[in-house]
């Protein structure tokens, strides 16, 4: 072992007699790095890539195999090799992957499988980016695949990137796929979901659209309130504040149905807090929940502010801020 050549000498070393690899098999795991470099033909490796994944090469041996492929394909690996990279994929840098042209969903799946159970790495992100750009849009099959491996994938895209998602792809989205989406992303996804589910009947439609409602405008919430949907508080709390504010007490009551009692527990949190401050006290009293608004209130103690709702809203909002 002491006579092992230095890395710089590796390419100059000749393969020892009788060690030339005729095929990629298990015997190669006992080859030292310089022996792999000298005795394994890169073209043989490329044609038998499918075998590499079944052989327990060490990390250091995988480095040598990658180096051989890099020399054989300096402009980037062909898809026939990429599809069979297996664990060698984990050795690739984003720079390596940017040279690839991956068009097959099967290739994408094979590589995602290697990284399964781990966070999305820069390599995987680059691979997906290359694949989606190559396809021109995020079609349903691709989205199906990506969200199966990475439930949070959709929420990692910018609003601009999401705009390339066709409405038909929305059918592949599960509620958990939207857990980490912010309002800007839901603003883009909601109209697509509305379009995708438009032919469904009321109750089925609500089940599908529910997780996208963080992007819904006021008029759509008003329409939903007429359909006995019984929205839960968790969904209500994710609605856009600007979409909730114009809703009347009667509309919110219809929208939430039996869940309306949950407003009391959320009265200090947006959007409930801001909505309460916009309502007449008389209207809020009809809910029987003890919610304290600021406008048109016969219970209200700040008479001097009663008709100046703007100032009053500010005052009450500050009062609640201080309490939190």
């Amino acid at each position: 072992d002491a006579a092992q050549p230095a890395a710089s000498e590796v390419e100059k070393t000749a393969c020892p007699s009788g060690k030339k690899a005729r095929e990629i098999d298990e015997s190669l795991i006992f080859y030292k790095k310089w022996e792999l470099e000298a005795c394994v033909d890169a073209a043989l490796l490329a044609t038998q890539m499918d075998r590499v994944n079944a052989i327990p090469f060490t990390y250091e041996q995988l480095d040598v195999l990658k180096h051989k492929l890099d020399e054989l394909y300096p402009q980037g690996y062909p898809e026939s090799v990429i599809q069979h990279l297996g664990y060698l994929f984990l050795k690739m840098s984003p720079e390596d992957i940017r040279k690839w042209n991956v068009t097959s969903l099967e290739t994408l799946k094979a590589l995602l499988e290697v990284n399964k159970g781990h966070e999305m790495s820069p390599q995987v992100a680059t691979l997906i980016d290359r694949f989606v750009k190559g396809r021109g849009q995020l079609d349903k099959d691709t989205l199906d695949t990506l969200t199966a491996f990475y439930p949070g994938y959709l929420c990692s895209l910018s609003p601009e990137e999401l705009s390339s998602v066709p409405p038909s792809s929305i059918w592949a989205v599960r509620p958990q796929d939207l857990d980490t989406c912010d309002p800007r992303q839901l603003d883009v996804l909601y109209p697509k979901a509305r379009l995708a589910f438009q032919n469904m009947n009321g109750s089925e439609y609500f089940v599908k659209i529910q997780s996208f409602l963080g992007g819904a405008p006021t008029e759509d919430l008003k329409a939903l309130s007429q359909q006995n949907v019984s929205m839960d508080l968790a969904t209500f709390m994710k609605l856009r504040t600007d979409a909730v504010l114009p809703l009347t007490v009667a509309e919110v009551q219809k929208l939430l149905g039996p869940h309306v009692e949950g407003l009391k527990a959320e009265e200090r949190h947006r959007p409930v807090r801001d909505w309460i401050l916009r309502q007449r006290q008389d209207d809020l009293d009809t809910l029987g929940l003890g919610l304290q608004g600021t406008r048109g209130s016969h219970h209200h103690h700040h008479h001097e502010f009663r008709h100046d709702s703007g100032l009053n809203d500010i005052f009450e909002a500050q009062k609640i801020e201080w309490h939190e």
Partner: antibody, heavy 120, light 107 residues
């Protein structure tokens, strides 16, 4: 939870063979390599070889080449290690040990061990 | 084959002590080293992999360091449960090899 359960202790005569089993549970059997490591009484650990449960391919340490055979049965998630032409110095505790496919080389779970005694 | 030499072979220490065990490789193994703890009559248990990564469920008083040919396992404050034999193991190249072990005993 991950478990590797090995067969009971064995007493063998020199020249005989022994076959030790290791039944895996609590994980996807074909997603991890399985190794065999032995430990003679009061001694250190010695790696014997590796099997890929997915395809059944094997690699053995040179010291055991020709005497050891590792096999697997995917239907029962069990791997086997057979050592032939036993001699007294083969008396040891034999362990199966799992390693992640992606790193191959360290062992995150071990069987409880099987004592093989070779004595005339 | 890559030889691993552990030192000391036996170490006497008391509860609460900070102890360090060393493992030297006969050639560079980068960071491809694991540490195990073994108690009498039991299978080894993985403590550290990739020289310094703590295995899930292992107390944080255990830590590993080093790369190339010199590695150490440190136990920051010995607990009664820590008295055992410790082995290092390289997985840089085949055959996989282990150090001779360090027996940690109560002083």
């Amino acid at each position: 939870q991950v478990q590797l359960v090995q067969s009971w202790a064995e007493v063998k005569k020199p020249g005989a063979s022994v076959k030790v089993s290791c039944k895996a549970s609590g994980y996807t059997f074909t997603s991890y390599y399985m190794h065999w490591v032995r430990q003679a009484p009061g001694q250190g650990l010695e790696w014997m070889g590796i099997i890929n449960p997915s395809g059944g391919s094997t690699s053995y340490a040179q010291k055991f080449q020709g005497r050891v055979t590792m096999t697997r049965d995917t239907s029962t998630s069990t791997v086997y290690m057979e050592l032939s032409n036993l001699r007294s110095e083969d008396t040891a505790v034999y362990y199966c040990a799992r390693s992640p496919r992606v790193t191959t080389g360290y062992f995150d779970y071990w069987g409880q061990g099987t004592l093989v005694t070779v004595s005339s | 084959d890559i030889q691993l030499t552990q030192s000391p072979s036996t170490l006497s220490a008391s509860v609460g002590d900070r102890v360090t065990i060393t493992c030297r490789a006969s050639q560079s193994i980068s960071s491809w080293l694991a540490w195990y703890q073994q108690k009498p009559g039991k299978a080894p248990k993985l403590l550290i992999y990739k020289a310094s990564s703590l295995e899930s469920g292992v107390p944080s008083r255990f830590s590993g360091s080093g790369s190339g040919t010199e590695f150490t396992l440190t136990i920051s404050s010995l607990q009664p449960d820590d008295f055992a034999t410790y082995y290092c193991q390289q997985y840089s190249s085949y055959p996989l090899t282990f150090g001779g072990g360090t027996r940690l005993e109560i002083k």
